[in-house]
Interface confidence: low
Amino acid sequence: SSSPTSSASSFSSSAPFLASAVSAQPPLPDQCPALCECSEAARTVKCVNRNLTEVPTDLPAYVRNLFLTGNQLAVLPAGAFARRPPLAELAALNLSGSRLDEVRAGAFEHLPSLRQLDLSHNPLADLSPFAFSGSNASVSAPSPLVELILNHIVPPEDERQNRSFEGMVVAALLAGRALQGLRRLELASNHFLYLPRDVLAQLPSLRHLDLSNNSLVSLTYVSFRNLTHLESLHLEDNALKVLHNGTLAELQGLPHIRVFLDNNPWVCDCHMADMVTWLKETEVVQGKDRLTCAYPEKMRNRVLLELNSADLDCDPILPPSLQTS
């Protein structure tokens, strides 16, 4: 393991277009980029908390696990990891907490073995639709990614460029149908208000989906029907009020599913009857005995499993004295 102390020797930040150029000089077998730590035995390179502004050009060809966390990368250009020879063994890439606000089309091209990518804790104001697919073709070459970690990538409100953040992320997930092999997708803590209806149908290999700590109010237009391999669905800490019949039936039909629904503000009125009936019968909801009502006030903290149809009424829109037949 080597840990050079010399200053980073990277190209000028005034010429960012150079970042997409393929490095022409193959690194020496034992070379380790400045400000990084390398272990050939572990096939690991760590450039952690070094305030790097660019991806090092001289990454060793043996790298299988690359950590670039805690830096100041800002922009990930096309071909940011393209090298000659290519980084053919790079399987796991962690870029979390590196102040990335833009990931451009083709940023992860020429990484044929990349199975896990973590972009968490970066304020991604501009995520290209072709960040993961690398091409704007209607059907791209399949991505090797099986695990995509995108927790807390929502930028501050004033940096969201007047467009749907949900839409931007989903466009990148669906472009070119490149992520058909994705098995784990984590999207926790992104202030999602909704889930675009197409997204899950086009990710048929998903085993684990984490949408916890968002602001999802409803799943009415979301279909889980095609996710026959789904094992865990995390919906904790959202703003869900009720799950309707269609959603309940789809979840019940998934053979391996475990659903997590803790800490949602369930509304216990007449619309909750189907969900309560389902909860009493299903085995798919983990910790279902801990789910409690948040509204209306008279039902607050009541356990959903302990409710019966008489508890679940809907107040008339008008007081009875003002209603006409």
Epitope: A91, Q116, V146, I149, R207, N213, H234, E236, N263, G287
Partner: antibody
Framework: EVQLLESGGGLVQPGGSLRLSCAAS????????MSWVRQAPGKCLEWVSA????????YYADSVKGRFTISRDNSKNTLYLQMNSLRAEDTAVYYC??????????????WGQGTLVTVSS | DIQMTQSPSSLSASVGDRVTITCRAS??????LNWYQQKPGKAPKLLIY???SLQSGVPSRFSGSGSGTDFTLTISSLQPEDFATYYC?????????FGCGTKLEIK
């Protein structure tokens, strides 16, 4: 049935090295993060290290950072802990455990039986 | 790092008693808290995850509550097999620290 079986523990001198292994079976190994937790004799549990399903993300307690390396071989369904520069205070039973859950809420739902590491001259 | 403080460190109680163990985090961890039971010479066993969800197969006399910084494990009616050491663990930060345990002994 999920099973985790640790091995590789033993007596080692201060400054020495040891590699622990944890053989996993009964589940889709590469889909789960894994962890090492230790317990010194008569002491509390101490979280040591964790690794994501593909091995791309690793985390360490401050007490072992720079000395221990967690890794996994998904083709062999095996988790490893390489321990270098061992100290007397590293003496403990080391458990491997499977993580379940998401980023903000994860828990260790299966544990191995533990392997004892003794660092003494 | 997030520190976890458990209290009391030890507790004597009788079969049938209602017992409460508390765990406090040094900062908010939302509901990312788990409770484990450990008996001498054995590996820990998961009881409660995500602050209040009962792990499959765990008796319903165990319950968890709390969010933010203050959490509670309650055993509604102690059984002989419940005498053990109980640990809380947070998984909100990158480093998933444990509390130092509460040893529950027979009075």
């Amino acid at each position: 049935e999920v099973q985790l079986l640790e091995s590789g523990g033993g007596l080692v001198q201060p400054g020495g090295s040891l590699r622990l292994s944890c053989a996993a079976s009964g589940f889709d190994f590469e889909s789960y993060a894994m962890s090492w937790v230790r317990q010194a004799p008569g002491k509390c549990l101490e979280w040591v290290s964790a690794i994501s399903g593909s091995g791309g993300s690793t985390y360490y307690a401050d007490s072992v950072k720079g000395r221990f390396t967690i890794s996994r071989d998904n083709s062999k369904n095996t988790l490893y802990l390489q321990m270098n520069s061992l100290r007397a205070e590293d003496t403990a039973v080391y458990y491997c455990a499977r993580y379940y859950g998401g980023y903000y809420s994860a828990w260790m739902d299966y544990w191995g039986q533990g392997t004892l590491v003794t660092v003494s001259s | 790092d997030i520190q976890m403080t458990q209290s009391p460190s030890s507790l004597s109680a009788s079969v049938g008693d209602r017992v409460t163990i508390t765990c406090r985090a040094s900062q908010s961890i939302r509901s990312a808290l788990n409770w484990y039971q450990q008996k001498p010479g054995k590996a820990p066993k998961l009881l409660i995850y995500a602050a209040s969800s009962l792990q499959s197969g765990v008796p319903s006399r165990f319950s968890g509550s709390g969010s933010g910084t203050d959490f509670t494990l309650t055993i509604s009616s102690l059984q002989p097999e419940d005498f053990a050491t109980y640990y809380c663990q947070q998984t909100y930060g990158y480093l998933h620290t444990f509390g130092c345990g509460t040893k529950l002994e027979i009075k």
